[in-house]
């Protein structure tokens, strides 16, 4: 009787148990009762990434300078090519198809964790004792600046946009 | 044994088209597939394309607009098919019989005798 | 398209020596998921078609006489005829069979002194 379900790394033609190609290889003839499946590699620009009874391997990804990517990690018959973004870029999606400039946080806020290709900048607001007056995509907030360590005294308050003023303190 | 042979016009006029039938013998095309290999002073050796035992063909991409290749499993021949030659198509055209061996590993492990076509007014 | 390279384009060998010729590709023929380098060589004696004498880089077909050892990895290759005889003089052919279109090298040819 003809099988109706196959092992695993097999799949059902002609009511007939066939191997499946290995990943990095295309499909060119589905096996017979006599013959085995016949198998290809994949070229220098394709790649198959699983056991599989495809025709054709698949393009690698093209990583667009134009859209800001550049490889990571060069595809092989078996994986896709990886891109991620240039310096100052990251990706706008998990499956990085194109990049945006890091944002920067604005006064007030410092970076929590500096972007890479892949993720954008995350920025967090100063805490009361810190504070950023700069448009920055790499600055953390700065704590203010301590006026008795410099003998000195709070003239004006310091908020998180902008540092303590300190002055002398009065002779009396 | 395995026999492959070959028959076939020996002189082209410029711009028609070249055909060539290899009848084999001792294997069956729906077990094998066949390959065509030209072989010219110029160029060397040149793989023009093969037809798979399931009948489905790869083209060499510099040859895939002018060339055809068919069968007729039940009368074990394969017809090769190519149009518009021009004089540095002059060469040896091979027919030969793909072993698969695995992982994806074809080789021509019988060849025909080959067909020398000449193109030329 | 992968190029395939040979060198020498010829040598002249007296019988009994050992004989090697090289192939490059322009490409690795090594798959990285099984491990098996995709290079053939055929040899094509004067006035024959050719004949297949090793696949998977260092396998022989059926029949060949073991002086015929195939080696190399990636994109160096070598033939080598351990001791050469009279009836060995031809022209070897290096072939990728890793993708289509598969490429052959321009070849060596082999005369015996």
């Known amino acids: 009787e003809p099988p109706t379900a196959c092992r695993e790394k097999q799949y059902l033609i002609n009511s007939q148990c066939c191997s499946l190609c290995q990943p990095g290889q295309k499909l060119v003839s589905d096996c017979t009762e006599f013959t085995e499946t016949e198998c290809l590699p994949c070229s220098e620009s394709e790649f198959l990434d699983t056991w599989n009874r495809e025709t054709r391997c698949h393009q690698h990804k093209y990583c667009d300078p134009n859209l800001g990517l550049q490889v990571q990690q060069k595809g092989t018959s078996e994986t896709d090519t990886i891109c991620t973004c240039e310096e100052g870029l990251h990706c706008t999606s998990e499956s990085c198809e194109s990049c945006v400039p890091h944002r920067s946080c604005l006064p007030g806020f410092g970076v929590k964790q500096i972007a890479t290709g892949v993720s954008d900048t995350i920025c967090e607001p100063c805490p009361v004792g810190f504070f950023s007056n700069v448009s920055s995509a790499f600055e953390k907030c700065r704590p203010w600046t301590s006026c008795e360590t410099k003998d000195l005294v709070v003239q004006q308050a310091g908020t998180n946009k902008t540092d303590v003023v300190c002055g002398p303190q009065d002779r009396q | 044994q395995v026999q492959l042979k070959q028959s076939g016009p020996g002189l082209v006029q410029p711009s028609q088209s070249l055909s060539i039938t290899c009848t084999v013998s001792g294997f069956s095309l729906t077990t094998y597939g066949l390959h065509w290999v030209r072989q010219s002073p110029g160029k060397g050796l040149e793989w023009l394309g093969v037809?798979?035992?399931?009948?489905?063909?790869d083209y060499n991409a510099a040859f895939m607009s002018r060339l055809s290749i068919t069968k007729d499993n039940s009368k074990s021949q394969v017809f090769f098919k190519m149009n518009s030659l021009q004089a540095d198509d002059t060469a040896i055209y091979y027919c030969?019989?793909?072993?698969?061996?695995?992982?994806?590993?074809?080789?021509?492990?019988?060849w025909g005798q080959g067909t020398s076509v000449t193109v030329s007014s | 398209d992968i190029v395939m390279t040979q060198s020498p384009s010829s040598l002249a060998m007296s019988v009994g020596q050992k004989v090697t010729m090289s192939c490059k590709s322009s490409q690795s023929l090594l798959h990285s998921f099984n491990q098996k380098n995709y290079l053939a060589w055929y040899q094509q004696r004067p006035g024959q078609s050719p004949k297949l004498l090793i696949y998977?880089?260092?396998t022989r077909e059926s029949g060949v006489p073991d002086r015929f050892l195939g080696s190399g990895s990636g994109t160096d290759f070598t033939l080598t005829i351990s001791s050469v005889q009279a009836e060995d003089l031809a022209d070897y052919f290096c072939q990728q069979h890793y993708t289509t279109p598969f490429t052959f090298g321009s070849g060596t040819k082999l005369e015996i002194k």
């Open positions: 037809i798979w035992r399931g009948g489905n063909t």
């Open positions: 998977f880089t260092s």
């Open positions: 030969a019989k793909n072993s698969y061996y695995g992982n994806g590993g074809h080789a021509m492990d019988y």
